[in-house]
């Protein structure tokens, strides 16, 4: 049964013959328990774990540092996965990033990154991006110079101000940067000109929030 | 460390011309909108002039409207004023500012440069 | 323009006591984005201006819990719970909603 094989990530069930999307238990190294993902096995290719996803406002993503690290909300909806197992699934080989985007007018768009991973946390979770490719805009919205992670409770941004409370939500802000996207869900009509919403500068602007996103990384190698 | 230092400054006649230079380091220069402030001696504080991170965008102050001219260099890390017909009452300490947050998402001045007297007098 | 109207413009007080600032806009200053652009900058003597409080009540990195702002649309105030010989300086509003920036005419706070 799925169950009982150990897969370290998305990309290890696709290759097991599950070629269907769904939510998908894997083990990752150095991990105590198995965690629940959702695995994208539809776009470019498949083998996509999905580490972060938003769609219809249902979950508030304005939390702390503790529920960042270790991931909140549910794997068929609305979810981050958590720091602590992005940081373990990257330790395990090299991941690329690929971030689906969705505006309120229906156009789709995407950022990928060749390489991906991010420190532990003692490192603030520190971002690291390489080779930024895609249809969201010709510059990298997501700072390729590497950023730590911020939330309410934990200021490590490069700014004077506290991004994270004033923009919402936890992200690898810089001063702040071009994107957040666990800021604030607003709805059709009310999603223009907000500076907290859902972020992704060189796709939509600096105050469109955006109506769906999805965060998903698979092994160079797949 | 964020540091804008600035020269230029100086003594210049009625109707004369000056340029200001603020050199920008320890930030990425090229992703934040720049200001010029000026205080008159003794006085408060006056916007002048405003250049977004690309240098698409500008805005100036009516009293220095087609006298005063804001340029940057994102290759030299660099922000320049021309000031140009200059008048007694431009007699003051300039300031460069950095907006606090990138991306020209105005929320005021989070660096301010050290200041430079300009004395217009004949 | 907006009219940015500071009191008192001069304020005498002891160390250890409160003070507290005013600032009057001729408009609201609450932006469609849901922000009040409302700074206030601290001028010492000799010294350049630095930022103490953005968006009329978020204190900057580095600036003291002494220091709070609070308001919304025209009204805005900036309190020092308990003074200190190192505030001495002019303080200033600034909003940013309307364009162009304007400043209040500073507040001078002396130590009595």
């Known amino acids: 049964r799925e169950e009982e094989k150990p897969f370290r990530d998305c990309a290890d069930v696709y290759q097991a013959g599950f070629n269907k999307s769904g939510i998908y238990t894997i083990y990752i190294n150095n991990m105590p328990e198995p965690k629940k993902v959702f695995c994208n096995m539809d776009v470019n290719g498949g083998g996509w774990t999905v580490i972060q996803h938003r769609e219809d406002g249902s979950l508030d993503f304005q939390r702390g540092w503790k529920e960042y690290k270790m991931g909140f909300g549910n794997p068929s909806g609305e979810y981050w996965l958590g720091n602590e197992f992005i940081f373990a699934i990257t330790s395990q080989r090299q991941y690329m990033l690929r971030i689906e985007l969705m505006d309120w007018e229906g156009n789709r768009a995407y950022s990928q990154y060749d390489r991906f991973h991010i420190g532990n946390e003692k490192q603030n979770y520190r971002l690291y991006l390489k080779g930024h490719t895609g249809t969201a805009g010709k510059q990298s919205s997501l700072i390729l110079h590497g950023a730590d992670f911020s939330t309410k409770d934990a200021d490590n941004d490069n700014c004077m101000c506290k991004c994270a409370l004033m923009l919402t939500g936890g992200w690898w802000f810089d001063a702040c940067g071009p994107s957040n996207l666990n800021g604030m869900f607003y709805t059709a009509g009310q999603n223009h000109g907000k500076l907290n919403g859902i972020k992704w500068h060189y796709f939509k602007g600096p105050s469109y929030s955006l109506r769906s996103t999805t965060m998903m990384i698979r092994p160079l190698d797949f | 460390e964020v540091q804008l230092v600035q020269s230029g400054g100086g003594v210049v006649q009625p109707g004369r011309s000056l340029r200001l230079s603020c050199a920008a380091s320890?930030?990425?220069?090229?992703?934040?909108?720049m200001h010029w402030v000026r205080q008159a001696p003794g006085k408060g504080l006056e916007w002048v002039s405003y250049?977004?991170?690309?240098?698409?965008?500008?805005y100036y102050a009516d009293s220095v409207k087609g006298r005063f001219t804001i340029s940057r260099d994102n290759a030299k890390n660099s922000l320049y004023l021309q000031m140009n017909s200059l008048r007694a009452e431009d007699t003051a300490v300039y300031y460069c500012?950095?907006?606090?947050?990138?991306?020209?998402?105005?929320?005021?001045?989070?660096?301010w440069g050290q200041g430079t007297l300009v004395t217009v007098s004949s | 323009d907006i009219v940015m109207t500071q009191s008192p413009l001069s304020l005498p007080v002891t160390p250890g006591e409160p003070a507290s600032i005013s600032c009057r806009s001729s408009q609201s200053l609450l932006h469609s984005h849901g922000y009040n652009y409302l700074d206030w900058y601290l001028q010492k003597p000799g010294q350049s201006p630095q930022l103490l409080i953005y968006?009329?009540?978020n204190r900057a990195s580095g600036v003291p819990d002494r220091f709070s702002g609070s308001g919304s649309g025209t009204d805005f105030t900036l309190k020092i719970s308990r003074v200190e010989a190192e505030d001495v300086g002019v303080y200033y509003c600034m909003q940013g909603t309307h364009w162009p920036p304007t400043f209040g005419q500073g507040t001078k706070l002396e130590i009595k």
């Open positions: 968006l009329g009540s």
């Open positions: 500012a950095r907006d606090l947050l990138d991306y020209d998402i105005w929320t005021g001045y989070g660096y």
């Open positions: 250049i977004s991170s690309s240098g698409s965008t500008i």
């Open positions: 320890g930030f990425t220069f090229s992703s934040y909108g």
